[in-house]
């Protein structure tokens, strides 16, 4: 299996950004997707049957989706850093993808460079 992510992305301070991962090249069943921040704190969990769980610190500015992705709103400079999606699958096990988000002071158009993690 392969995780494809939105790669390195930029977004404006005060704006919002969509963090997206996609698992391909496997027939494994996705049981859960975990979203974690650069300091290894948890943002959200998406359980395949029950749906979303949002970590308390992010309840006011994280919107689940689209899909298995996550929308982070009201961005601050402190949001700059790595984000990880962890796919828990059966029977394959765990797949992990990385996204780097840069929050910019000035108005810069979002840039998305897609890359793959085998």
């Amino acid at each position: 299996g392969t995780i494809e992510t939105t790669g390195n992305i930029s977004a404006k301070k005060g704006g919002s950004v969509i963090l997206q991962c996609h698992l391909s090249s496997t027939m494994a069943q996705v049981t859960q997707v975990n979203w974690e921040q650069h300091d290894h704190s948890l943002l959200a969990i998406r359980n395949a049957e029950l749906g979303w769980h949002i970590y308390p610190a992010f309840k006011d500015r994280v919107a689940p989706g689209p899909g298995l992705g996550l929308t982070l709103q009201s961005l601050t400079m402190n949001d700059t850093g790595e984000y990880f999606c962890t796919y828990h699958t059966y029977p394959d096990g765990t797949y992990r993808g990385r996204i780097f988000l840069e929050v910019l002071e000035s108005s810069v158009a979002e840039h998305s460079a897609r890359f793959q993690i085998p």
Partner: antibody, heavy 127, light 106 residues
Framework: EVQLQESGPGLVKPSQSLSLTCSVT????????WGWIRKFPGNKMEWMGF???????SYNPSLKSRISITRDTSKNQFFLQLHSVTTDDTATYSC?????????????????????WGPGTMVTVSS | DIQMTQSPSLLSASVGDRVTLNCKAS??????LAWYQQKLGEAPKFLIY???SLQTGIPSRFSGSGSGTDFTLTISGLQPEDVATYFC????????FGGGTKVELK
Amino acid sequence: EVQLQESGPGLVKPSQSLSLTCSVTGSSIASDYWGWIRKFPGNKMEWMGFITYSGSTSYNPSLKSRISITRDTSKNQFFLQLHSVTTDDTATYSCARMPSFITLASLSTWEGYFDFWGPGTMVTVSS
Amino acid sequence: DIQMTQSPSLLSASVGDRVTLNCKASQSIHKNLAWYQQKLGEAPKFLIYYANSLQTGIPSRFSGSGSGTDFTLTISGLQPEDVATYFCQQYYSGWTFGGGTKVELK
């Protein structure tokens, strides 16, 4: 105050089905997430499954082939059925609520913990 | 499955003592941990969520700490009404419970 109360037969024969009812007052089962948990002799506890505010279900993989959780919103009750029971299913069965949180996108999300429980009902599987 | 191990299984203490109960996860669960109190013949009572957040209405002598794999429930100043079994539960991946710690008075 949310209250839950389990009811059902205390004795079930091996190979038969165990059927329990959880009656809820103080909260609508059409909101939040509602679960069944059992405690075996010796204190080991096991999450069995949930029924959600929308009526969809999630089951412990170890029980998936034998378990069914349903509900009756008009009576504010939800139900557990466990098929083909053995003596290993002897336990105290409890129902509980897992609260929800409404997100920015008006989506109901689960909180993970159980904030209200029933007192539990002891079920013995024996011939 | 994530295994949750509680220690000790039995704890004897005196009224007023500071009591510490431990819960260990078999892998990191971040702070996705809850604590419950169950008295004999009663429904479990929800005490703490996210490892250290006290549920509304729970006395402040109860506190939780920890993250990752090691967690602690502390009762600072044990009261007679605190005699009960305490158990932890993770909700990082599925839902699993510890075996419980029974707290009794010396």
